[in-house]
């Protein structure tokens, strides 16, 4: 099949890093500077990605593979291939169009990216607030108020972990 294909299409013999040059009787020409082809049989080479501005080069472009970018310090990547960079904020903040802003009361962000999220509402699970929330941290929910009645143990010791197929020691 490969032999048949090459007889029909001389371009299929052109390896990665070259292109099939129609202007030169379909011979395989090397990709020009700042371009690449990552597969064989290409009729053109793609232009290399330039990591400029807020991007920095993680991997240089070669004749057979594109450059890869990441973001300069103080920024983080967005998208699978780091196609966008976004400014970091401090924990307890979120990025708006006007820059980093503190989380509103009742919300938190424990990362340098993303948005402020509402504190967990412990009462929805019938629990009480054990540790108050801050701009940087969610509330910690504790046992329900009923569990804390006199004589009741406030913390139940965890059952011993048992892995499948193993008998307890």
């Amino acid at each position: 099949f490969e032999r048949t294909r090459s007889l029909q299409d001389p371009c299929s013999n052109c390896p990665a890093g070259t292109f099939c040059d129609n202007n030169r009787n379909q011979i395989c020409s090397p990709c020009p500077p700042n371009s690449f082809s990552s597969a064989g049989g290409q009729r053109t080479c793609d232009i290399c990605r330039q990591c400029k501005g807020v991007f920095r080069t993680r991997k240089e472009c070669s004749s057979t593979s594109n450059a890869e970018c990441d973001c300069t310090p103080g920024f983080h990547c967005l998208g699978a291939g780091c196609s966008m960079c976004e400014q970091d904020c401090k924990q307890g903040q979120e990025l708006t169009k006007k820059g980093c802003k503190d989380c509103c009361f009742g919300t938190f962000n424990d990362q340098k990216r993303g948005i402020c999220r509402p504190w967990t509402n412990c009462s929805l699970d019938g629990k009480s607030v054990l540790v108050n929330g801050t701009k940087e941290r969610d509330v910690v929910c504790g046992p329900s108020p009923a569990d804390l009645s006199p004589g009741a143990s406030s913390v139940t010791p965890p059952a011993p972990a048992r892995e499948p197929g193993h008998s307890p020691q």
């Epitope: 990605r49 501005g53 807020v54 998208g79 699978a80 966008m84 400014q87 169009k97 006007k98 820059g99």
Partner: antibody, heavy 114, light 110 residues
Framework: EVQLVESGGGVVQPGGSLRLSCAAS????????MHWVRQAPDKGLEWVAI????????YYADSVKGRFTISRDNSKNTLFLQINGLRADDSAVYYC???????WGQGTLVTVSS | QSVLTQPPSASGSPGQSVTISCTGT?????????VSWFQQHPGKAPKLMIY???KRPSGVPDRFSGSKSGNTASLTVSGLQAEDEADYYC??????????FGTGTKLTVL
């Protein structure tokens, strides 16, 4: 050679819809964020929207938020802009551009008129 | 959306130098070294002339140069030529992924 070719513009009535397309070639489209930028007649450039390589992040100008939707088909090397609820002040040439604005298409004209 | 401020027009004779300013805030121009400049001839798409404040893409003549001081960026065109007559726009990164452009300057070669 990098090429960006926009299409889908035309004359539409207020409140109407259009879907603009931008066909890309000469670069690895799937690795780049892409923009739409518009320019009203005899006016300046106005950024409209950006989409990340994998569509996970989309940002819009306040003036179009809720009415415009940016999307892409990496298998077809094509960028889209769905524009709904068109208003007279949306009349403009719409350009697609590669992130960092290294390369621009020639634009497609959208005219909103009753 | 905020916009960067440029003078509406600038002019110069062939061979002279002309500087176009672009004023923003410390949230955009002042906060980052990521200013770009574009040239646009009538009926044509914009073309990137300067990026990262003062870097030129390949193919752009070295007559075009950029600089920045505080919240103001500048584009200087030296040895002015007839083909430099066009509209010029600045743009700045602003932290989030909403891009902002300048109001535009019409450069006339006298």
């Amino acid at each position: 050679e990098v090429q960006l070719v926009e299409s889908g513009g035309g004359v539409v009535q207020p409140g109407g819809s259009l879907r603009l397309s931008c066909a890309a070639s000469g670069f690895t489209f799937r690795t780049y964020a892409m923009h739409w930028v518009r320019q009203a007649p005899d006016k300046g450039l106005e950024w409209v929207a950006i989409i990340s390589d994998d569509e996970t992040h989309k940002y819009y100008a306040d003036s179009v938020k809720g009415r415009f939707t940016i999307s892409r088909d990496n298998s077809k090397n094509t960028l889209f802009l769905q524009i709904n609820g068109l208003r007279a002040d949306d009349s403009a040439v719409y350009y697609c551009a590669v992130h960092d604005f290294d390369f621009w298409g020639q634009g497609t004209l959208v005219t909103v008129s009753s | 959306q905020s916009v960067l401020t440029q003078p509406p027009s600038a002019s110069g004779s062939p061979g002279q130098s002309v500087t176009i300013s672009c004023t923003g805030t410390n949230s955009d121009i002042g906060g980052y070294n990521y200013v770009s400049w574009f040239q646009q001839h009538p009926g044509k798409a914009p073309k990137l002339m300067i990026y990262d404040v003062n870097k030129r893409p390949s193919g752009v003549p070295d007559r075009f140069s950029g600089s920045k001081s505080g919240n103001t960026a500048s584009l200087t065109v030296s040895g002015l030529q007839a083909e430099d007559e066009a509209d010029y726009y600045c743009s700045s990164f602003a932290g989030s992924n909403n891009s902002i452009f300048g109001t535009g300057t019409k450069l006339t070669v006298l």
